[in-house]
């Protein structure tokens, strides 16, 4: 007595490693009071859910803390939030609404999540020109990273005299006091998304005038 429903939207979604994706899911009906079960997202072919709101159910260790069921039956919402996407999240998923107390449940169609290599790169902002002996704040930002993801780790590489300035979740400030001999040298901002184990970087050449 399983009731099947179609997930709205595309049959597959693409996300880059380390980033986030929302798998949209909308219940086919407003649930009556008589049916008020728990929601589960499953990897195709698996018995243990990747995400659930059932307090008595374990989820797969690989997805714990990264996959979240955004459950709001009042708004028919059963979407799956994935953060810190990893290559091995590349799979087909489906949603199931089930209560062990009730005979019937609701099962969605499958949706494939494709996890691609991280091609986004950080942006380095230099306000104005670099002058010898004058300190400047350089900002490395990853505005394309998602809010709910694990905050990335920023690293700077430079031969010039530097110190670290303030950082936000998605940006880091480097205070640089360049010397004449630093002209033409490389400055690299490296950003590691530890939640997924991927790194991206950008290198610029310093123009000290």
């Amino acid at each position: 007595q399983e009731r099947r429903f179609q997930l709205e939207g595309p049959e597959s979604l693409t996300v880059q490693e380390g980033l986030c994706v929302l798998v949209p899911c909308r219940l086919p009906t407003t649930l009556p009071a008589s049916y008020y079960g728990y929601g589960y997202w499953f990897l195709e072919g698996a018995d243990v859910p990747v995400a659930t709101n059932d307090p008595d159910e374990e989820v797969q260790e690989e997805t714990r803390g990264r996959f979240h069921l955004l459950w709001d039956p009042r708004r028919k919402n059963c979407s799956l939030s994935i953060r810190d996407a990893r290559r091995r999240d590349n799979a087909a998923y489906f949603f199931r609404l089930k209560s062990k107390w009730m005979k019937y449940g609701y099962t969605s169609s499958k949706l494939s999540v494709r996890v691609m290599a991280l091609t986004h790169r950080p942006k380095i902002l230099i306000p104005g020109t670099l002058e010898p002996g004058h300190s400047k704040n350089l900002t490395c930002s990853v505005s394309w990273a998602c809010e709910q993801g694990t905050p990335p780790i920023f690293s700077w590489l430079s031969a010039a005299p530097t110190s670290l300035g303030p950082r936000t979740t998605h940006s880091s400030v480097l205070i640089i006091t360049p010397r004449p001999q630093d002209h033409g040298t490389n400055l690299t901002c490296q950003v590691k998304f530890a939640g997924a184990g991927v790194t991206t970087e950008r290198t610029i050449q310093l123009n000290v005038t």
Partner: antibody, heavy 114, light 107 residues
């Protein structure tokens, strides 16, 4: 019309047993979990027990665990509550309700007294 | 077990008044909260399920709100037939506990 009718209540001495029944009609009884809820005189509602649609899952309030048994017969559309080792504090109106508690019976009164 | 507390335990109000009853859970129960009305000698009647979903046939003057641990039942304009006892109940996990009730009587 969706209906639940409890029966089997009455006066019983402490330590004795009683079996309550709840006859269901107007809906597919075998698809729904069912509850027993009780209410002592002048007191609030107390959840007693729940049983899954097929009888494979059961859960009880701590106050009745080990003494009460919830069961069902889907072929007869009937829910049961077997109450053993009854105590004075079990005196109450006993209601059966479907899983969503949107359908309730009128209740049956159980009085435990010597 | 999840404990539910209700406030106030009783209140006196007049016809036409706006009445608010609160229910607090001892831990987060998401939106798995229901509200019931009970009149003396009668079985409880489901008013609101899933914290804010109005049960079929229940007048729109009843509304529910909240999520997590704090919930509210509001009667926008109290009618004579609304004088009763109101209970919250959680269906997040077993045991499916009820709150102690709030008695609404005539001022």
């Amino acid at each position: 019309e969706v209906q639940l009718v409890e029966s089997g209540g009455g006066l019983v001495q402490p330590g004795r047993s009683l079996r309550l029944s709840c006859a269901a009609s107007g809906f597919t009884f075998s698809s729904y979990g069912m509850h027993w809820v009780r209410q002592a005189p002048g007191k609030g509602l107390e959840w007693v027990a729940v049983i899954s649609y097929d009888g494979s899952n059961k859960y009880y309030a701590d106050s009745v665990k080990g003494r009460f048994t919830i069961s069902r017969d889907n072929s007869k559309n009937t829910l049961y509550l077997q109450m053993n080792s009854l105590r004075a504090e079990d005196t109450a109106v006993y209601y059966c309700a479907n899983y969503g508690m949107d359908v309730w019976g009128k209740g049956t009164t159980v009085t435990v007294s010597s | 077990a999840i404990r539910l507390t209700q406030s106030p335990s009783s209140l006196s109000a007049s016809v036409g008044d706006r009445v608010t009853i609160t229910c607090r859970a001892s831990q987060s129960i998401s939106s798995y909260l229901n509200w019931y009305q009970q009149k003396p000698g009668k079985a409880p009647k489901l008013l609101i399920y899933a914290a804010s979903s109005l049960q079929s046939g229940v007048p729109s003057r009843f509304s529910g709100s909240g999520s997590g641990t704090d919930f509210t039942l509001t009667i926008s304009s109290l009618q004579p037939e609304d004088f009763a006892t109101y209970y919250c109940q959680q269906s997040y996990g077993t045991p499916f506990t009820f709150g102690p009730g709030t008695k609404v009587d005539i001022k």
